[in-house]
Every structure is written in structure tokens, then in C-alpha cells.
Interface confidence: low
């Protein structure tokens, strides 16, 4: 089946202080290789989340990604303050055996706004 | 059926060293977080240290720090806590705990399994 | 450490709730549940409110605002044990409260 990234919302507005949910689906799981979410574009861009293992504070994912067919890759942001402002940029890369691993497809980005409480 | 078997624990003299290992069977072990939590006696759950699925990220609770040291082997489907210089208060069962499909080891929100646990004694 | 009440009490049939409060920003509580002492404690809830297959839908988990709760209907004499939550700091240090004592009255 042939690989696209969906992140349904252009935009989300979330309250500071609240949650909200960045939604991104798979088609395919190949080829191998791992999901990231970056906020931003470009080589400045920021690496929030990569299903890797680490902790990463007020960040989860939303399903079970360890399941065998698993395609959601959407996450949730806890307690979203003004600097969590910015694009959302869900990315497939493929593995690489010894060189970095290459960026296949990032879905269209998802836009959050924070509002003042 | 997922199951978690603790082994390694016993006597142990203060100032020495443990090496407690879980197996892991019935899940897909490289897939998932792993913890310790010990609890000793007449007391709570206390969180010891933690793994993520790979390997690459480890944690720790501020009562072993310094002293422990945490791994796995995917390819066994195994984990390991190592203690150094083990004090009396070190005496607890010691559990090995599964993540479910969220979080990292501290994560303990996302455990979902435990083993029957391994009694650990330090005294001279 | 987290924040749970010491003990809580009820009839069989009637709905417990006990409730957690002060894990980090990530907000996500589990509950697990210890029928004696030195005996392997089970999961009921994990990830606020998803339970393993193994546990019987009276116990539910919920999380509103930094709080989470365990809810127990109709409470059976088996449910008498000490429940545990746990979650994690900031710094993604683990963390469990002290323990809540249910007593299963009757």
C-alpha cells in the first residue's frame, strides 16, 4: 500500500493550561523506519516526540504504537503553555543501516494556537 | 500470558553488590519500558529505576542513585538491576514491572504488569 | 510523592472512589492494587483509565484537571486490599502515593 501521512487539522486552539490531541495516521508501516514530530520546518526545526522510549515531559502518545499494525501516531500535549505555539509536523523516515536515517514524507502540518486563559 | 520472572534475589551483606534479572515471556519484549519497584517491609511501593523499550534511555530513583545501574538484553528478553554498596534499608521485595503500549521507565502510570518479586535481605 | 487518603470505606454494592493528585504535567495516573503485604501487586488502571483484560469492568479510572480517581462499583468483599497510585514527576522520576486502605464493611 502506498505511504501517506494524514494529519486531518490544519489548525487546533487549545487554552494554556489544557490538553490537546495532534492527530497523524499512517497508510503503511513501510519502510521501516521511525515516526518523529517536529515543530517547525527547516534545519532549525524542533524535535518534540519520536516514539523512541524517552520521557518526554507533558508528551504521550495517544495509541498503542507497540502494536503489530498500529498506524495512529497521534500525540497529546498536557498542560500546553504559549511556547508550545508553532507548527506540528508529523514524519516518517526510512532506517538507515549506517547512514542517518532519511526523511521519506512529513503530513501537512498542524497549526496550534494557544489561548490566554 | 505475559509473565515477569524475578530472579537473583537472597542475603546480602552490607557494602556488596546484587544482581537481580527479570524474564520477560508472552509479549513482545523489545517493545516495551520496563521498571523495578521494591517495597520493603511493613512499608509502600517505592520506584527503584527504569528502562526504555531500546535501551538507550535509563532512569532512576533518588534512593539508588549513584549506586545502580539498569539494562536489558532484547535478545534474551531480559532486564537487569545492578545495586552497589547495599545498605540495610536496600532490604525489600523487588518487582519487575511491564509498560503498557504509553510511556517510558518512570512512567508508572503506564505499568500494566508485575512479577511475583524477589526477596532481597541485606544484613551482616 | 503523590497524594491519596490514607483509607476509605464501604458497603458491599455500593461506589468507591479514591483519588491522586500531584504528578507532574504529564497528568496520567495508574492504580494497583495489594491484597496483603509482601504479595505481588495487579494493575487495575493504567494510562488514567485503560484496564488490562484481566480486570473486571467495575473498576474505572478517570483524570479531571490534576487528579486522578479509581472508581469501584459495586464494591465486592475480594476488592478489600491497599490500592496504590503511581505516575511520574517532571523530571520523569517515578512516583506512588502512600497507599489507600479499602475496607469492604459487612
Known amino acids: 500500500k502506498e505511504l501517506k501521512v494524514t494529519q486531518p487539522e490544519k489548525s487546533v486552539s487549545v487554552a494554556a493550561g489544557d490538553s490537546t490531541v495532534l492527530n497523524c495516521t499512517l497508510t503503511s508501516l513501510l519502510p521501516v523506519g521511525p515516526i518523529r514530530w517536529y515543530r517547525g520546518v527547516g534545519p532549525s526545526r524542533l524535535l518534540i516526540y519520536s516514539f523512541a522510549g524517552e520521557y518526554v515531559p507533558r508528551i504521550r502518545n495517544v495509541s498503542d504504537t507497540t502494536k503489530r499494525n498500529n498506524m495512529d501516531f497521534s500525540i497529546r500535549i498536557s498542560n500546553v503553555t504559549p511556547a508550545d505555539a508553532g507548527i506540528y509536523y508529523c514524519v516518517k523516515f526510512q532506517k538507515g543501516s549506517s547512514e542517518p536515517d532519511t526523511e521519506i514524507q512529513s503530513g501537512g502540518g498542524t497549526e496550534v494556537y494557544v489561548l490566554a486563559k | 500470558a505475559v509473565t515477569l520472572d524475578e530472579s537473583g534475589g537472597g542475603l546480602q551483606t552490607p557494602g556488596g553488590a546484587l544482581s537481580l534479572v527479570c524474564k520477560g515471556s508472552?509479549?513482545?519484549?523489545?517493545?516495551?519500558?520496563m521498571n523495578w519497584v521494591r517495597q520493603a517491609p511493613g512499608k509502600g511501593l517505592e520506584w527503584v529505576a527504569g528502562?526504555?523499550?531500546?535501551?538507550?534511555?535509563?532512569y532512576y530513583g533518588a534512593a539508588v542513585q549513584g549506586r545502580a545501574t539498569i539494562s536489558r538484553d532484547n535478545g534474551q528478553s531480559t532486564v537487569r538491576l545492578q545495586l552497589n554498596n547495599l545498605r540495610a534499608e536496600d532490604t525489600a521485595t523487588y518487582y519487575c514491572?511491564?509498560?503498557?503500549?504509553?510511556?517510558?521507565?518512570?512512567?508508572?502510570?503506564?505499568?500494566?504488569?508485575w512479577g511475583h518479586g524477589t526477596e532481597v535481605i541485606v544484613s551482616s | 510523592a503523590l497524594t491519596q487518603p490514607a483509607s476509605v470505606s464501604a458497603n458491599p454494592g455500593e461506589t468507591v472512589e479514591i483519588t491522586c493528585s500531584g504528578g507532574g504535567s504529564n497528568n496520567a495516573y495508574g492504580w494497583f492494587q495489594q491484597k496483603s503485604p509482601g504479595s505481588a501487586p495487579l494493575t487495575v488502571i493504567y494510562d488514567n483509565g485503560k484496564r488490562p483484560s484481566d480486570i473486571p469492568s467495575r473498576f474505572s479510572g478517570s483524570k479531571s484537571d490534576s487528579t486522578g480517581t479509581l472508581t469501584i462499583t459495586r464494591v465486592q468483599a475480594e476488592d478489600e486490599a491497599v490500592y496504590y497510585c503511581?505516575?511520574?514527576?517532571?523530571?520523569?522520576?517515578?512516583?506512588f502515593g502512600a497507599g489507600t486502605t479499602l475496607t469492604v464493611l459487612g
Open positions: 508472552g509479549f513482545t519484549f523489545s517493545s516495551h519500558a
Open positions: 528502562i526504555s523499550s531500546d535501551g538507550r534511555f535509563t
Open positions: 514491572t511491564k509498560n503498557g503500549g504509553c510511556g517510558s521507565g518512570g512512567d508508572l502510570d503506564c505499568i500494566d504488569a
Open positions: 503511581g505516575s511520574a514527576d517532571n523530571s520523569g522520576a517515578g512516583v
